[in-house]
């Protein structure tokens, strides 16, 4: 504006390029850059990408909106992901096959070792890769309770599609509850949304991981692709520093 | 501060009342205060007051989030609020009294007049008064789609309560459908959740409005508390106002 | 050969010139900014003899309100007892004590900085900081500031001890 | 909404999103984290005007009140609104770690 | 967070919610609104520092950085994080009107 | 500014051994993997060998596995070539140079120490 | 072994030219690529790492491109001083490999 001293653009972008370089150091709670000495040569792990490619595929995803951030969610968040326990595993026996539901189950240990105490959890998605649909469905989620109870969790209404499409539950808490207790193997149950009057219950949707009878190269393909848990975590050693700074700044 | 300017609190302060009487009438979209001849004499209507204190309990309960706030969002809204039809009308002899089910209907009629247009509406609350209820329940809320199909919205699991609570179910996308149908009457139904094995689908929260055999100036009281949709829309005068300003600034 | 200062006249603007060279060009800056590491674009130069504000410490909630003086070059400040040295809650934090970047600001050490102004043998001469004159009214708060090579030391009066942390003289408590 | 989608394409003057893409190798120097090479940052800039309003309402400077001073603050200022994570990948020794960084993308800007 | 808890019980000089209560009547010398009397708009004020994260890193100014300038922003300014409406009574002729004003009350602030 | 000086070369008859140097400075020197490329007369570049910041991990040509030993000490600034059982195929120009941070290219070099194998 | 093979491998241009080197790598390396430049009896100097990224203080007439198995080296408009050999590296795996080298040389 004619009165006010002319904005150095330059300056500005070199301010904002500074701040977030301390910015990134101090959500990743670096003093400095890390040492790089023993990075090993050649391409980032397949595995690694394809975490990576998940966790910006779940940005991409996500509404762009300022959540007001307490004090832990400015660290950044470790993520790894638990792969469902496979089909051939004997828990899976334990569940008779049902037209209107699914089962998944996973190995808490693994979990534990993801994410060793609950309050570090930030947040727990359960994703599935859901395969073409022909009809709307509508869906529940519900999890593992008692010996053989399930208890409800939430539901979505599915459109059809003919492409594959991840699905995405949140279930921090339920994955936190997990880690607090002393379970060795935790599960979830998809199932066909029952109303009260209807008898026709069948869960038309086609889950990744589940169908049987493919060709060994395609099943490996498609057991990478199994549910899985996307974990999103405060790392331990970080967390010590958390509590040590607990005072006002 | 010690080597800045001090800080004018006085001025501040002064700076931010100014602001906000603009910013009062900027969002009422009035250029001056609204002239006082006509007012009657008395106090605030009931009804009025009912009113009022329903929209300030609603925002009690809300969390104080920052929403990214879209242009029409800024602008006052009108609260208006529209009754269920009582249930000795003869809409509910068409739907069989269950034990999983409880129904509410309302008249179009009333909610054009409240919202002429169904682009006005920017919320709508279905606010249900429940009784204390002695064991947790799982409910489903319904509307009514079409002949004598009902399409899912939403769910709730209720905790056990010794003390009445209004319930509040966020129904804008269905008023905003039935404002642009030519419906007379539009409902909508409460219905325990039916899982697929389970058999004990039984509706047992009491919610006001329904029950019968009351004293007469109890069962006054006890309508009054009936459902009601909360509606929150732009006045039309204002919104005329701002289809001409569309332009960007 | 292109020239790409004709072809872009807005390179090194706002703060320099554009100097053409074969298969290249390099910016010349005006004085107080300095050349990029590319040497693509001019920088400001926190020039050692600028004036600004010294912070006594970034522990405080109002780290911007512990100024310890306000007329201070960023020697005199980080060289001495200063946590970081700027002007309107903008700070460049100074440099940890033994870091390569520390013995660059200082290179004499605590207490002390360079005088450009006397050149002994080529070298400027390096000159005790005078901690009292610089920032006396805050460090030494109800006591008597004495300078000595390097640091300073606070005399108090009789039932008072100095306190190092508040940097005042504080009642004995008996 | 002063978001990427208008203010990338407009002049304006006020408060709005800027383009800014930081490279990690050039603007920062950084060759330790391996994914993304780079982000689009952005910033807010631009002025939000204080309007007083005296008691001679009037249309015209009301209407700005939408843009300028929503919040109608004492100094409003031109921050961001609508954020967005991002994730990196880089090493800690011999592993390579993937990490969710909040509220690093500009998406869109107010004046509050 | 900087929120009433925290600030209205502190001496914080540095961005902060502070109290403010609108007496329509008193402060706008307004009689038109009927309900409610008067609200608790509060605002936010005091510096965000911005640190010039120089590549001598150290732990104790990355801390600043999370309440200070957790944005990264060139100019970190103080303002609304959590804003509430607020509800009011007011006549068109003889007709009362139930009215909510978004975004009217400030319950705690930040640095952006 | 970084430095790397190489020393150690010099004459050696077929069979025998030799034990490069390299000082680093200007640098935190275990923050980098360190490496050795070679040169022979008129020809062009061969890489030998490099070793992780701690000294954990190390990597070999497979003409030069198990003859040639790669160390370093962290507290001497200090890159090592222990080269035995050498040959004529040796003789080169020795470099050491800086592995870039996690990336593998090699950001800055020494002058080089000669090496020659011959009887 | 990742074999690297450039090409050509020698050239002679004049001052001002546009210069082009290419590097095959016998199997995919992504753009695990660098570039060096060296003149005789000096050490190597890196020009371009990670296939298309300039090294901090190179002059921004030269660049780089390429992926998977096929790199070049561009220099925009040669100078005097950039009369040398260059090299390239993988950095895929090790062994690391270079290759054999391109001589540019004054017309």
């Known amino acids: 504006l004619s009165t006010c001293k002319t904005i150095d653009m330059e300056l500005v972008k070199r301010k904002r390029i500074e701040a977030i370089r301390g910015q990134i150091l101090s959500k990743l709670r670096l003093a400095s850059p890390p040492s790089q000495g023993e990075v090993p040569p050649g391409p980032l792990p397949e595995a690694v990408l394809a975490l990576y490619n998940s966790t910006r595929d779940r940005v991409a995803g996500e509404s762009a909106e300022p959540e007001p951030e307490p004090e832990a969610d400015y660290y950044a968040k470790e993520v790894t992901r638990v792969l469902m326990v496979e089909t051939h595993n004997e828990i899976y026996d334990k569940f008779k096959q049902s037209t209107h539901s699914i089962y998944m189950f996973f190995n808490t240990s693994e979990l534990r070792e993801a994410v060793p105490e609950p309050v570090l959890l930030s947040r727990a998605e359960l994703r599935l890769l859901r395969l073409k649909l022909k009809v709307e469905q509508h869906v529940e989620l519900y999890q593992k309770y008692s010996n053989n109870s399930w208890r409800y969790l939430s539901n979505r209404l599915l459109a059809p599609s003919d492409s594959p499409e991840w699905l995405s539950f949140d279930v921090t808490g339920v994955v936190r509850q997990w880690l607090s207790r002393g379970g060795e193997i935790e599960g979830f149950r998809l199932s066909a949304h029952c109303s009260c009057d209807s008898r026709d219950n069948t869960l038309q949707v086609d889950i990744n991981g589940f169908t049987t009878g493919r060709r060994g190269d395609l099943a490996t393909i498609h057991g990478m692709n199994r549910p899985f848990l996307l974990l999103m975590a405060t790392p331990l050693e970080r967390a010590q520093h958390l509590q040590s700074s607990r005072h006002r700044r | 501060l010690s080597t800045c300017k001090t800080i004018d609190m006085e001025l501040v302060k002064r700076k931010r009342i100014e602001a906000i009487r603009g910013q009062i009438l900027s969002k009422l979209r009035l250029a001056s205060p609204p002239s006082q001849g006509e007012v009657p004499p008395g106090p605030l209507p009931e009804a009025v007051l009912a009113l009022y204190n329903s929209t300030r309990d609603r925002v009690a309960g809300e969390s104080a989030e920052p929403e990214p706030e879209p242009e029409a969002d800024y602008y006052a809204k009108e609260v208006t609020r529209v009754l269920m039809v009582e249930t000795h009308n003869e809409i509910y002899d068409k739907f069989k009294q269950s034990t999983h089910s409880i129904y509410m209907f309302f008249n179009t009629s009333e909610l054009r007049e409240a919202v002429p247009e169904p682009v006005l509406l920017s919320r709508a609350e279905l606010r249900l008064l429940r009784l204390k209820l002695k064991v947790e329940q799982h409910v489903e809320l319904y509307q009514k789609y079409s002949n004598n199909s009902w399409r899912y919205l939403s769910n709730r699991l209720l905790a056990p309560s010794d003390s009445p609570e209004w319930l509040s179910f966020d129904v804008t996308g269905v008023v905003r459908q039935w404002l642009s149908r030519g419906g007379e009457i539009e409902g909508f139904r409460l219905s325990a959740h039916c899982s697929c094995d389970s058999r004990d689908n039984t509706l047992q929260v009491d919610i006001n409005g329904f029950t019968t055999g009351r004293r007469g100036d109890l069962a006054t009281i006890h309508g009054m508390n009936r459902p009601f949709l909360l509606l929150m829309a732009t006045p039309l005068e204002r919104a005329q106002h701002l289809q001409s300003s569309r332009h960007r600034r | 050969d292109i020239d790409e200062c004709s072809q872009d006249p807005s390179l090194c603007l706002p703060h320099g010139a554009c100097k053409n060279l074969q298969g290249s060009y390099v910016c010349v800056c005006d004085e107080g900014f300095t050349p990029t590491q590319d040497q693509h674009g001019c920088e400001e130069v926190e020039q050692p003899h600028h004036k600004k504000e010294c912070y006594l410490n970034f522990d405080d909630t109002v780290f911007c309100d512990s100024v310890l003086a306000t007329n201070v070059t960023q020697q005199e400040c980080c060289c001495s007892l200063g946590a970081g040295w700027g002007d309107h809650c903008e700070i460049y934090p100074c440099p940890v004590y033994s870091s390569a970047e520390f013995h660059s600001l200082c290179p004499d050490g605590k207490g002390y900085t360079q005088d450009n102004n006397i050149v002994n043998y080529g070298i400027p001469a390096h000159r005790d900081i005078d901690e009292c004159m610089l920032f006396g009214s805050e460090i030494c708060k109800e006591g008597k500031c004495v300078n000595t090579q390097p640091g300073y030391e606070c005399y108090c009066k009789q039932g008072f001890y100095y306190d190092g942390n508040l940097l005042e003289c504080v009642d004995v408590d008996e | 909404a002063l978001d990427t989608n208008y203010c990338f394409s407009s002049t304006e003057k006020n408060c709005c999103v800027r383009q800014l893409y930081i490279d990690f190798r050039k603007d920062l120097g950084w060759k330790w984290i391996h994914e993304p090479k780079g982000y689009h940052a952005n910033f807010c800039l631009g002025p939000c005007p204080y309007i007083w309003s005296l008691d001679t309402q009037y249309s015209k400077v009301l209407a700005l009140y939408n843009q300028h001073n929503p919040g109608a603050s004492a100094a409003p200022c031109c921050v961001p609104q609508a954020l967005e994570p991002l994730p990196i990948v880089y090493y800690v020794g011999r592993k390579p770690k993937v990490e969710q960084l909040s509220n690093m993308i500009v998406r869109s800007c107010k004046c509050s | 967070a900087l929120d009433t808890n925290y600030c209205f019980s502190s001496t914080e000089k540095n961005c902060c919610v502070r109290q403010l209560y609108i007496d329509f009547r008193k402060d706008l010398g307004w009689k038109w609104i009927h309900e409610p009397k008067g609200y608790h708009a509060n605002f936010c004020l005091g510096p965000c520092p911005y640190i010039w994260s120089l590549d001598t890193q150290y732990s104790k100014v990355l801390a600043l950085y999370n309440q200070h300038n957790p944005g990264a922003s060139a100019a970190p300014c103080c303002v609304p994080q959590a804003l509430e409406p607020l509800p009011i009574v007011y006549y068109v002729g003889r007709k009362p009107k139930v009215e909510q004003l978004s975004n009217m009350i400030v319950r705690s602030c930040k640095c952006s | 500014e970084v430095q790397l000086l190489e020393s150690g070369g010099g004459l050696v008859q077929p069979g025998g051994s030799l034990r490069l140097s390299c000082a680093a400075s200007?640098?935190?020197?275990?923050?980098?993997?360190m490496t050795w490329v070679r040169q022979a007369p008129g020809k062009g570049l061969e890489w030998v060998s490099a070793?992780?910041?701690?000294?954990?991990?190390?990597y070999y040509a497979d003409s030069v596995k198990g003859r040639f030993t790669i160390s370093r000490d962290n507290s001497k600034n200090t890159l090592y070539l222990q080269m035995n059982s050498l040959r004529a195929e040796d003789t080169a120009v020795y470099y050491c140079?800086?592995?870039?941070?996690?990336?593998?290219?090699?950001?800055?070099w020494g002058q080089g120490t000669l090496v020659t194998v011959s009887s | 072994d990742i074999q690297m093979t450039q090409s050509p491998s020698s050239l002679s241009a004049s001052v001002g030219d546009r210069v082009t080197i290419t590097c095959r790598a016998s199997?995919?390396?992504?753009?695990?690529l660098n570039w060096y430049q060296q003149k005789p009896g000096k050490a190597p100097k890196l020009l371009i790492y990670?296939?298309?990224s300039l090294q901090s203080g190179v002059p921004s007439r030269f660049s780089g491109s390429g992926s998977g198995t096929d790199f070049t080296l561009t220099i925009s408009s040669l100078q005097p001083e950039d009369f040398a050999t260059y090299y390239c590296?993988?950095?895929?795996?090790?062994?690391?490999?270079f290759g054999q080298g391109t001589k540019v040389e004054i017309k």
């Open positions: 140079a800086r592995v870039s941070s996690g990336h593998w290219d090699f950001d800055y």
């Open positions: 200007g640098f935190t020197f275990a923050d980098y993997a």
């Open positions: 070793i992780s910041g701690t000294g954990a991990h190390t």
């Open positions: 199997q995919s390396i992504s753009s695990y």
């Open positions: 990670d296939a298309s």
């Open positions: 590296q993988q950095s895929y795996s090790a062994p690391f490999t």
